[in-house]
Structures are given as C-alpha cells and as structure tokens.
C-alpha cells in the first residue's frame, strides 16, 4: 500500500521528505517565499495530501504561483511608475510613487519606493503598507517674486502667478435689506482653507457688533489676476466662516479668520498656498522686508473719501503689490499714540511702511497676507494680515499700516483646520 514518490512543485517543497510513503502518511506542500500554493484556482499558504489505502494520493500536487500584488493604488495628487520591465506587479517588483511637482511634495520625504512583498502587498521601508501623502507645496510661486519695490498706492501691476496664494473674497450680505456688498483679500493655506482678517467677514451694518456673515454670502476667487476677467479664476463658495473668538471690533485685536472652502481647489501655477510661520510671539523683526498684494485703491491722487463718496469701484482691476519694511513696535505705537483718537497697537499686531510715506496698503486690501521670504526654508511665509491704518490717507507720512501678527495664532489656526467641526478630514502641511 505504498503511494508513488512525489515530485515537489517548482518553487516549492514537500515535508516530510521520505523515501517511502505508506497508507495514512501525510505530506505538506508549501512554496518558497514569494510564492503561494495554487489549487483549483484557490490560493493558500500550504496544502496537505494523504496516502490512501489504495496506494493513491488524496490529491494531485498543486503548483506554486508567484505572489502578485496587483495594480498599485492610485495616489491623490501623485502618480506611480514601474521600476520593473513589462510593468510587473509580482513578488520583488518595484514601483515608485511621486507627487505632482512642483505643486505637491511627499510628506516625511520618503523615497516613494514600494516593493511587492511575499504577503502580496506593496510595502515601503518606512511607511510599510500605508500610501505616501502628497501635500501642497507652500510659499513657492512658480515665478520668482522680483526684487523691485512696487506699491499698491500708485503701483504697477503684479504679473499672473506672482502671488498664487492671493484670494479675492467677495461678500454679499443678503440678510440685510438692501443687500450689503464688499470685498477683501485672503491667502490660501491649503486646498480647502483661506486665511483672512476677521473684519472682512463680519456684518457691516452694526458697527459695534461682531456678527459673522453667513457662509452662503461668501465667494472666494483664486488664481485671479484681473477682476474684469474672472474666466480663468477658480471660484468657490464657503463651507464654514470662522472668526477668532476674541476679535475685538473696537481695537481690531485678534483680527484673524478662516474660510473653509466648499470643495478643495486644484493647485497649479496660479493657485498655490502660502506657508504659515512658526508659532512665536516675536513676529517679524524690524526692517525685514515683506510683500503685500491686493486689489484695493491704487490711485495715489484720489483720496479714500473721494472714492467712497463717488460710488465708483474701489478695486484696482489688476492685482497690485508693494514691498514694505517692518517697523519696530515701539515706533509704531508711538506714531499712533501721538494721534487724536483711541488707537491701540497690541502685541497681536505689527506695523509696516515707510516714515516718509508713499507706499502702503489701502482700503480693499484688508485680509491680504504680508509675506516674508524665509531664508532657512526658502519659502514665503504669511507673517501678517492687512488689518487697519490711521485716519489719514493711505501712504501718508508716518502713518504705518497695521497687520495682524499671524505667528501668535498658528496654534489656533491648526486647531481649527484639524478640528472635528471641519467639514472634511483635511490634511494640512505643518
């Protein structure tokens, strides 16, 4: 009652290996690493057969089939390339994930190389079975920002793509009769979040109250260059409007807010986020140069009052920008204390501008980011938000523009953007 001698499968083995197999003897067929037992179209780790009374084996010896990890999963904002010829997906084959450059980069700076493991899964040395994450690249416009000193007041045009984080925020408050309509600026922080000043997003009709506008009344334009031509821009409605809980309407302290967009915006040459600073109370150092862009008043010969009273558009048609130095807190505080009126330059603010005037942000630029180039990271960082200015004309002598100090709010911003109240679970680069 001996059973015939067994031939182990290719890429496999039989245990125990005996010269003779008798009735009731059992053998276990297994495969080499990276191969699986294939039997009746079923895949298994091992297969047992038994020598029967009649001298026959209970089953035929199965074959060993190479493990196949299958087509790799797609990567959001990324792509996959095969390192092995013929795009093989079998054991020990390699693939490489990469992010859509230059708009996205890989989190954790992993190589992105995945190998088909013996278990049938694509595996990376660091991330194991998890896919890499492609995060938006912040603060690196596709065109380098020039070194020229331009101004928003009396300024020349910014070129398309110089400020890809710049957002135009249009608010139409239909809860009031008649409707109130105004605009401001903001800065893209990620595919779904806009940073702006709180005063841009509060109802205008009750000057001593902080009533946030309804999300339905907010439209955000990104990738916009000329306000007369919105065809190339991405427009988005708001999913949430979040004003800083301590925003003070009397002195504009904590003048910072977020808008979560209804759906993530596609990033590209004209739509890219700005980086947030490190959370530090000092803020930008005096004399550091920053850039601000906006569609606010740009005619140096027309007064704010004239523009307001004329009822003509306050917008500059084409985005303007200005380069301004940060002013020491003491100097700015002193310049405002010397004025009549109750001006308060708090520790949550910093000032920028020139003693002699001539270059400044103005009405309609509110909420735009004051960006400074960080030499260490080689990124542009949003250090400030256009907040308020003195009673005199924009660009007047010794009237500095006042900006919200963003570095004081980084923790609050991350908290809000990653809170369960956020409409989706959003990944934001830190």
């Amino acid at each position: 009652n001996e059973c015939p001698k067994l031939q182990p499968p290719v890429y496999g083995k039989i245990e125990p290996s005996q010269a003779v197999y008798s009735f009731k003897d059992q053998v276990l067929v297994s495969c080499d690493t990276g191969y699986k037992v294939l039997k009746d179209n079923g895949v298994m780790d091992t297969f047992q057969i038994e020598c029967l009374k009649d001298g026959a084996w209970s089953n035929k010896i199965p074959t060993c089939k190479i493990v196949d990890c299958g087509a790799p999963a797609g990567l959001k904002h990324g792509l996959v390339t095969f390192s092995t010829r013929n795009n093989l997906t079998t054991y020990k084959s390699e693939i490489r994930y990469s992010c859509q450059q230059p708009y996205y980069k890989m989190l954790h700076n992993t190589t992105g190389v995945y190998t088909c493991s013996a278990h049938g899964t694509w595996t990376n040395e660091v991330l194991k079975r998890s896919l890499p994450t492609c995060l938006p690249v912040c603060g690196q416009p596709s065109r380098a920002l020039p070194n020229l000193v331009k101004r928003i007041i009396g300024g020349r045009n910014a070129e398309l793509g110089l400020f890809p984080w710049q957002a135009l925020i249009v608010v139409e408050d239909t809860s009031r009769v008649p409707n109130d309509k105004w605009f401001g600026s903001g800065a893209l922080l990620s595919e779904s979040w806009i940073l702006t000043a709180a005063h841009v997003l509060r109802s205008q009709r009750r000057d001593n109250t902080v009533i946030p506008v309804s999300k339905e009344h907010v439209t955000v334009y990104l990738g916009l260059h000329d306000v007369r031509d919105k065809s190339g821009a991405v427009n988005s409605s708001a999913a949430r409007v979040i004003l800083h809980p301590d925003f003070n309407i009397q002195n504009y302290n904590h003048d910072i807010a977020l808008v979560q967009l209804q759906k993530p915006v596609p990033l590209g040459a004209h739509v890219m986020p700005i980086c947030l600073p490190r959370p530090e109370p000092e803020g930008p150092a005096p004399h550091m140069l920053g850039l601000v862009a906006g569609w606010g008043i740009s005619n140096p010969n027309v007064t704010v009052d004239e523009i307001i009273l004329s009822g003509t558009r306050t917008l500059s048609d084409v985005l303007q920008y200005v380069k301004l130095p940060v002013v020491s807190h003491a100097e700015c505080k002193a310049s405002y204390e010397s004025r009549s009126g109750n001006y308060s330059v708090t520790e949550n603010m910093f000032c920028a501008g020139y003693y002699e005037g001539g270059k400044d942000t103005c009405l309609g630029d509110s909420g735009g980011a004051f960006v400074i180039f960080d030499e260490m990271s080689q990124h542009w960082v949003a250090q400030g938000l256009v907040s308020w200015g003195g009673p005199e004309e924009c660009g007047s002598k010794q009237v500095y523009g006042v900006y919200t100090k963003v570095s004081n709010y980084v923790d609050w911003l991350w908290e809000e953007m990653n809170s369960p109240r956020a409409v989706r679970d959003l990944q934001v680069e830190r």
Partner: antibody
Framework: QVQLKQSGAELMKPGASVKLSCKAT????????IEWVKQRPGHGLEWIGE????????NYNEKFKGKATFTADSSSNTAYMQLSSLTTEDSAMYYC??????WGTGTTVTVSS | DIVMTQSPSSLAVSAGEKVTMSCKSS????????????LAWYQQKPGQSPKLLIY???TRESGVPDRFTGSGSGTDFTLTISSVQAEDLAVYYC????????FGGGTKLEIK
C-alpha cells in the same frame, strides 16, 4: 408682495408677560433680519433689537436687555417678541420690520392695573 | 449710542412748495468698506405704520414718487420734497443703522 402681519392689541396687568407675534409672507423668512421697534407718543421710535430667523442670531439694544426676548419659528414664518415684568412704561405700539424696509401692522400693548 | 437730531420738529407748507428737512448724526454714518451711508428716511402717516422712502441716504425705494430726494454724507443729511402734495402730510423720521439703530425725533409736516 412682502407683508408682516402682527397679532392683536393686548391689555396686560403690571408684572405680567406678553408674547407678540409677527407673521411674514412674500419672501424667504429665514434669510432676512426681523427688527422690533417701540413707539410711544412723545417718545418717538426706539429700536429694541433684531433676530435672524435662519440662525437664531440676535442683537439687543442695551436698554431692552432682560425686557425683550426674540424667538422665531421657521415652520410658520413667524417671529416673536416676549416682553416680561411689564410696567406702565411698556405701554406702546410695537412694530416688527424686515431689516430696513417693510414694517408690520403694529401691536398696541396697554399695561394697566 | 449715535444720537440723531432732526430739524425742524414741525413745519407747515402749502401744496406745491418745496420743503427740506435736516437730520444730523453725532458720528459719521459712512462705512468705508461698503461705501454706503447707513441712513434711511421713513414717512409715517397718521394712524399708519412707517414706510421706507429712502435708504443709503440717497437711494429712493421703489414705488416712492421722485419728488422725494435724499442727500448728504457722513453726519449731515437732508430729505427734500420738491413739490409737496396733500397726501405728504406725515411725520418723517431718519434712522441710522451704521451702529445699533437709533431714530431721529421726527419732523411733522403739515399742509397749510
């Protein structure tokens, strides 16, 4: 067209509370602020406060905080104002209005012992 | 609170005459962001609810006869009736909504 119909006249005793109603028709009730105004002969018009029915957000004139309470029922398109601890000073005509434009028919409240 | 002062408190004119009434606010009602003066004029005829005539200081509400004109900016505002009609007999109120709203004391228009 837009109309605001207010509840009928009320004769109340001092110390009591009264709830006035304002039913809106002809527009989307939830999307516009409803304001309340008090008018007494010789005292002109006084703004009491406002409510945005869709969100329940309210603003009160400091003078009427604790005296007036606003609510709104979106299912019936009706705004309400409750006046508490009534005194003779509360005897007046009370109007609701849609934000700035359309005024209600008015409700006369008389407080008398 | 913003104080609204109307003058005169009353005036009597003959039908067909031009009439102007003034409303002054204790602070500017001009919002620089929306570029609007948050001032409205209302007409209240005897035994009736007030009716909106003018908003944003100078915009005539639809259906209001063009003999009613609002003007002014900042703190000084005027309502002009170019040719008074008998049905214009009423009290005219200004109201600011720049801040927590306040009304002027009213100008009573009587027809001689």
């Amino acid at each position: 067209q837009v109309q605001l119909k207010q509840s009928g006249a009320e004769l109340m005793k001092p110390g009591a509370s009264v709830k006035l109603s304002c039913k809106a028709t002809g527009y989307t009730f939830t999307g516009k602020w409803i304001e309340w105004v008090k008018q007494r002969p010789g005292h002109g018009l006084e703004w009491i406060g406002e409510i945005l029915p869709g969100t329940g957000s309210t603003n009160y004139n400091e003078k009427f905080k604790g005296k007036a309470t606003f609510t709104a029922d979106s299912s019936s398109n009706t705004a309400y104002m409750q006046l508490s601890s009534l005194t003779t000073e509360d005897s007046a005509m009370y109007y609701c209005l849609r934000s700035e434009d359309v005024w209600g028919t008015g409700t006369t409240v008389t407080v008398s012992s | 609170d913003i104080v609204m002062t109307q003058s005169p408190s009353s005036l009597a004119v003959s039908a067909g005459e031009k009439v102007t009434m003034s409303c002054k606010s204790s602070q500017s009602l001009l919002n620089s962001r929306t570029r609007k003066n948050y001032l409205a004029w209302y007409q209240q005829k005897p035994g009736q609810s007030p009716k909106l005539l003018i908003y944003w200081a100078s915009t005539r509400e639809s259906g209001v006869p063009d003999r009613f004109t609002g003007s002014g900016s900042g703190t000084d505002f005027t309502l002009t009736i170019s040719s008074v009609q008998a049905e214009d007999l009423a009290v005219y109120y200004c109201k600011q909504s720049y801040n927590i709203p306040t009304f002027g004391g009213g100008t009573k228009l009587e027809i001689k």
